[in-house]
Interface confidence: medium
């Protein structure tokens, strides 16, 4: 009887155990994606930026995917989105094409399912960037709590992308999910 | 045997709320942590910020570590970092050294076993603070999700601390830990 | 004998289910609320932001109320409070009334309790938006961790509310449960 | 419509006084107001600049100790008084308000006034 019970109490903690592993902080997807600035395309036009390192440095990913310049949700559930968008130019670099920007960024979201893409988030700011300050620098920071479904893809937009500071300190986005859906 | 049951059954209830204490969302490390504003340097260089509140009005600190002017990690984990920085200026403060500025933060962390300093996050603008204005404010957010193990030192460094606004909703940072690492 | 354990392992198993779906990351309350732009104030005075979407596109509220212009909390806890708040005007809207913005959100804390409020975060900027100019934008965020009790109220005050951007991804606050209170 | 008038020039001997004087009218609110002079065959150059409460000013090198900048924001006018002259400061002299760019820097002044003749004989 003794080694039964004991056998009953094993089964007992051995399926908590998988439900706590299942439920436990641990197992909770997250993405932190820097930029990858050898491939930073070039102009003033609105651009969606699809180089990003997931694994060097500040950079990681766990239960999401990293593909085609996109951060792929692999599990149901509401995620804090976040970015951080840096701006900068020196005169060294050359004249800027216009001393009036607009420095912005998007973060979209685009269901496969039914094909459409969604701005979630947007930031920045107009800015004059005069000639006569040999450096000028402008960072953008974007946070939101957003349901995402098992498909869907987080992307990055900005304008002025040869602009962009290629520091993994100052340009990069990321999620981590926060709860279940309902 | 029914009696030995109901105390199989305890160890089993006992081992689990063991187990649910610990992974409890009540156990999280976090800090929020608000400038001290009777120690903030002078001057426009760039500065590491060690006067901060931990225990007053909005700023708390659980199972972590203040201490000399940095945030201590006492618990591996997944960690979303923030800080948001206010700076101002009015003219009855005298004149600024100058009008062109850079207003600028770095989010830093320090390992102790490996001496190093590394930028997390940065966050920024240069500003044209022009005299045609008695009043001028700028403020920046940062914020990103990182892997931090215990020991590890978290830093604010700023540039143009006398320019800080010294309110608690104006100038503070802080870290709560999202989840464990694999 | 083996019928009784079955019926005390399911009485262990139901137990823990109670629990577990207590604890569960789905019971943790949330909000992410979108301007509602149909009712924004209009003048350069700091106002009180009163309308709020809470259950179309991007917006939703789980656990806890949204009413009278006010962000409800239900649950003790400590949470993840965030703003985003963007300002924007074109030349074809008319001229600015001065072109001199202080653009700036306060994020405000009321206890009905003990009647009071509190500023817990700010962020904005001073702006010179000249007629030199056809567009002008400018975003602020931000965010931090705030111990918050049932009853207590959350609101967002803007300088300037005739120039928010009404889009959903622009001009949003929100709010989510990261962990209980010791 | 913003003018700026400025009056007061004139000749003087060297190691004599003069004082400029610029009247602002049109102007919605109270800005940065400069003073710039321009000698012959050469570029613009700053000479002084006053916020507009009048406690902040700033001085080119060349007539800090001599000149002094002041602003009266009642009757909308600025002052420049120039003692020590010298020959080297002879110049047509600008009044500039509303600086956008930078004291210092002519190309950022959004509204400037006609011209007043100043010569420091030797």
């Known amino acids: 009887g003794s080694q039964h019970i004991r056998a009953e109490k094993a089964m007992v903690d051995g399926s908590w155990l998988d439900l706590a592993k299942r439920s436990k902080l641990e197992a909770q997807p997250f993405a932190h994606l820097t930029i990858n600035a050898t491939d930073i395309p070039s102009g003033s036009h609105k651009v969606s930026l699809s180089s990003w390192y997931h694994d060097r440095g500040w950079a990681k990913i766990s239960n999401m995917t990293f593909s085609n310049g996109k951060l792929i949700v692999n599990q149901d559930g509401f995620y804090y989105l976040y970015a951080n968008i840096c701006f900068r130019h020196h005169e060294t670099s050359g004249d800027l094409a216009t001393e009036y920007l607009q420095l912005m960024v998007y973060v979209t979201k685009t269901s496969i399912k039914i094909p459409s893409s969604h701005t979630l988030m947007k930031g920045g700011s107009t800015k004059y960037w005069s000639g006569n300050s040999e450096f000028h620098f402008y960072s953008i920071n974007v946070g939101g709590f957003f349901k995402l479904r098992s498909g869907e893809e987080i992307s990055i937009e900005v304008s002025n992308p040869s602009l962009l500071d290629p520091d993994q300190d100052a340009t990069y986005f990321g999620a981590f999910k926060v709860r279940d859906i309902d | 045997g029914s009696q030995h049951i109901r105390a199989e059954k305890a160890m089993v209830d006992g081992s689990w709320l063991d187990l649910a204490k610990r992974s409890k969302l009540e156990a999280q490390p976090f800090a929020h942590l608000t400038i001290n504003a009777t120690d903030i340097p002078s001057g426009s260089h760039k500065v590491s910020l060690s006067s901060w509140y931990h225990d007053r009005g909005w700023a708390k600190i659980s199972n972590m570590t203040f201490s000399n002017g940095k945030l201590i990690v006492n618990q591996d984990g997944f960690y979303y970092l923030y800080a948001n920085i206010c700076f101002r200026h009015h003219e009855t403060s005298g004149d600024l050294a100058t009008e062109y500025l850079q207003l600028m933060v770095y989010v830093t962390k320090t390992s102790i076993k490996i001496p190093s300093s590394h930028t997390l996050m940065k966050g920024g603008s240069t500003k044209y603070w022009s005299g045609n204005s008695e009043f001028h404010f700028y403020s920046i957010n940062v914020g990103g999700f990182f892997k931090l193990r215990s020991g590890e030192e978290i830093s604010i460094e700023v540039s143009n601390p006398s320019l800080l606004d010294p309110d608690q909703d104006a100038t503070y940072f802080g870290a709560f830990k999202v989840r464990d690492i694999d | 004998g083996s019928q009784h354990i079955r019926a005390e392992k399911a009485m262990v198993d139901g137990s823990w289910l109670d629990l577990a779906k207590r604890s569960k990351l789905e019971a943790q309350p949330f909000a992410h609320l979108t301007i509602n732009a149909t009712d924004i104030p209009s003048g350069s005075h700091k106002v009180s932001l009163s309308s709020w979407y809470h259950d179309r596109g991007w917006a939703k509220i789980s656990n806890m109320t949204f009413s009278n212009g006010k962000l409800i909390v239900n649950q003790d806890g400590f949470y993840y409070l965030y703003a985003n708040i963007c300002f924007r005007h074109h030349e074809t809207s008319g001229d600015l009334a001065t072109e001199y913005l202080q653009l700036m959100v306060y994020v405000t804390k009321t206890s009905i309790k003990i009647p009071s409020s509190h500023t817990l975060m700010k962020g904005g900027s001073t702006k010179y938006w000249s007629g030199n100019s056809e567009f002008h934008f400018y975003s602020i965020n931000v965010g931090g961790f705030f111990k918050l009790r049932s009853g207590e109220e959350i609101s967002i005050e803007v300088s300037n509310p005739s120039l928010l951007d009404p889009d959903q991804d622009a001009t949003y606050f929100g709010a989510f449960k990261v962990r209980d209170i010791d | 419509e913003v003018q700026l008038v400025e009056s007061g020039g004139g000749l003087v001997q060297a190691g004599g006084s003069l004082r400029l004087s610029c009247a602002a009218s049109g102007l919605t609110t109270v800005y940065t107001m400069a003073w710039f002079r321009q000698a012959p065959g050469k570029e613009r150059e700053f000479v002084a600049a006053?916020?507009?409460?009048?406690?902040?000013?700033y001085y080119a090198d060349s007539v800090k100790g001599r000149f002094t900048i002041s602003r009266d924001n009642a009757k909308n006018t600025v002052n420049l008084q120039m003692n020590s002259l010298k020959p080297d400061d002879t110049a047509v002299y600008y009044c500039a308000a509303k600086a956008l760019l930078g004291m210092t820097n002519p190309a950022g002044y959004e509204y400037w006034g006609q011209e007043t003749q100043v010569t420091v004989s030797s």
């Open positions: 006053i916020t507009r409460s009048g406690k902040t000013t």
